[in-house]
Amino acid sequence: EVEKTACPSGKKAREIDESLIFYKKWELEACVDAALLATQMDRVNAIPFTYEQLDVLKHKLDELYPQGYPESVIQHLGYLFLKMSPEDIRKWNVTSLETLKALLEVNKGHEMSPQVATLIDRFVKGRGQLDKDTLDTLTAFYPGYLCSLSPEELSSVPPSSIWAVRPQDLDTCDPRQLDVLYPKARLAFQNMNGSEYFVKIQSFLGGAPTEDLKALSQQNVSMDLATFMKLRTDAVLPLTVAEVQKLLGPHVEGLKAEERHRPVRDWILRQRQDDLDTLGLGLQGGIPNGYLVLDLSMQEALS
């Protein structure tokens, strides 16, 4: 069909409404004014346009805003956001959290798309850091968001933002990420009392050093085995049997089921067998009684 540029008589759009769904693609192109579309973007989402028709509407906005859409338009893109490419989004300057929320809502329930990743990246870079409200919003839509960031990116998270993090947000974080997040969490929760502090810090303990685990063992915290198994092996190894017993409290019984897995396995190898026997759990593999234990860590570092 030959492209027609003139709008047929009587078809010029006075407003964005449902009558437009009956327009052919060329009629939308010819009869919808881009400036009208921009001012009435909030209506587009309520109208069941086809994907082809949405392509036309996007094209009209692209012509009107070649340097990137203004935030007043972006906030009301709705399903038209799904038509945007990462290249389109890189031209935007999104500063409002409400705009971010509106666009994330469109993609809700789906994996993080390249478009969403680009949008978030633009938004966070624009703000200069991952503040609490932003983190709260992002982890609500994408629980794994925090763990998708590099340790370098995580270093820009201020301690105050840690309050927005839920345990499930850290499920896929690796030790390097927790190494960055743990000190921030420790700082964020430092004024809480013992039991409340442990509840909050628990999810971050995969980044905790030995000294902090020793301190926790004196606070009657009853760490569960799932948390213990996520601790850094190098942080667990120096703990004594008595310290692990105090750290785990009633959960110490669970060590038996995990004795072949790290870090329990490696910890057992570092303990005297007679100390392990005091637990009455049948843990085997400790240093036999009567053997001399040498600290070779310095020698290993020098060799």
Epitope: P250, E253, G280, L281
Partner: antibody, heavy 116, light 107 residues
Framework: EVQLVESGGGLVQPGGSLRLSCAAT????????MHWVRQGPGKGLVWVSR????????VYADSVKGRFTISRDNAKNTLHLQMNSLRAEDTAVYYC?????????WGQGTLVTVSS | DIQMTQSPSSLSASVGDRVTITCRAS??????LTWYQRKPEKAPKSLIY???SLQSGVPSRFSGSGSGTDFTLTISSLQPEDFATYYC?????????FGQGAKLEIK
């Protein structure tokens, strides 16, 4: 496979004595704390005594303190309960159990009846 | 001594039902609580330790919750093999003490 087999139960007169034994197989006996637990007819479970892995620490329920003695022979993988001055209320099935505060494995029990 | 009180002492339910048994300690025992399943002529079997941790090999339909003085054992969907007597036990301090048991019967 962990197995605990109790023996030594039977009928005894009030004031009499009995020695229960528990033979342990399928695990390193010398590493585990052991317990005796009993259950009287139509009653619930009652903890009796505990011994640590090397036999240096024992604890008893008040109701048997001074009358019962728990001991172990790690060389023979055997747990014992020496019961003296038996009373009618000591009538029960006696179980040995492995574990710390939690009894992870139990024997099938041996019946002790105290009656004149 | 720490007293442990279970309720109900007996209950009847059908296969597929969700069942809850409670246990109350006479003083704070933290999470130092374990649950056992006992079938006639069989040795007790440990199901849950530390109030909510599942012993290895125990089906996930069993779960425990609570801390301090009030605890719950829940069976999310009863199976024929679950009909038994259930005991709670504290191991916070000696003497170790058990609840009086809760007998779960087929309706």
């Amino acid at each position: 496979e962990v197995q605990l087999v109790e023996s030594g139960g039977g009928l005894v007169q009030p004031g009499g004595s009995l020695r229960l034994s528990c033979a342990a197989t399928g695990f390193t006996f010398s590493s585990y704390w052991m317990h005796w637990v009993r259950q009287g007819p139509g009653k619930g479970l009652v903890w009796v005594s505990r011994i640590n892995s090397d036999g240096t620490s024992t604890v008893y329920a008040d109701s048997v303190k001074g009358r019962f003695t728990i001991s172990r022979d790690n060389a023979k993988n055997t747990l014992h309960l020496q019961m003296n001055s038996l009373r009618a209320e000591d009538t029960a099935v006696y179980y040995c159990a492995r574990g710390r505060g939690i009894m992870t494995y139990w024997g099938q029990g041996t019946l002790v009846t105290v009656s004149s | 001594d720490i007293q442990m009180t279970q309720s109900p002492s007996s209950l009847s339910a059908s296969v597929g039902d969700r069942v809850t048994i409670t246990c109350r300690a006479s003083q704070d025992i933290g999470s130092w609580l374990t649950w056992y399943q006992r079938k006639p002529e069989k040795a007790p079997k440990s199901l849950i330790y530390a109030a909510s941790s599942l012993q290895s090999g125990v089906p996930s339909r069993f779960s425990g919750s609570g801390s301090g003085t009030d605890f719950t054992l829940t069976i999310s969907s009863l199976q024929p093999e679950d009909f038994a007597t259930y005991y709670c036990q504290q191991y916070k301090s000696y003497p170790l003490t058990f609840g009086q048991g809760a007998k779960l019967e087929i309706k």
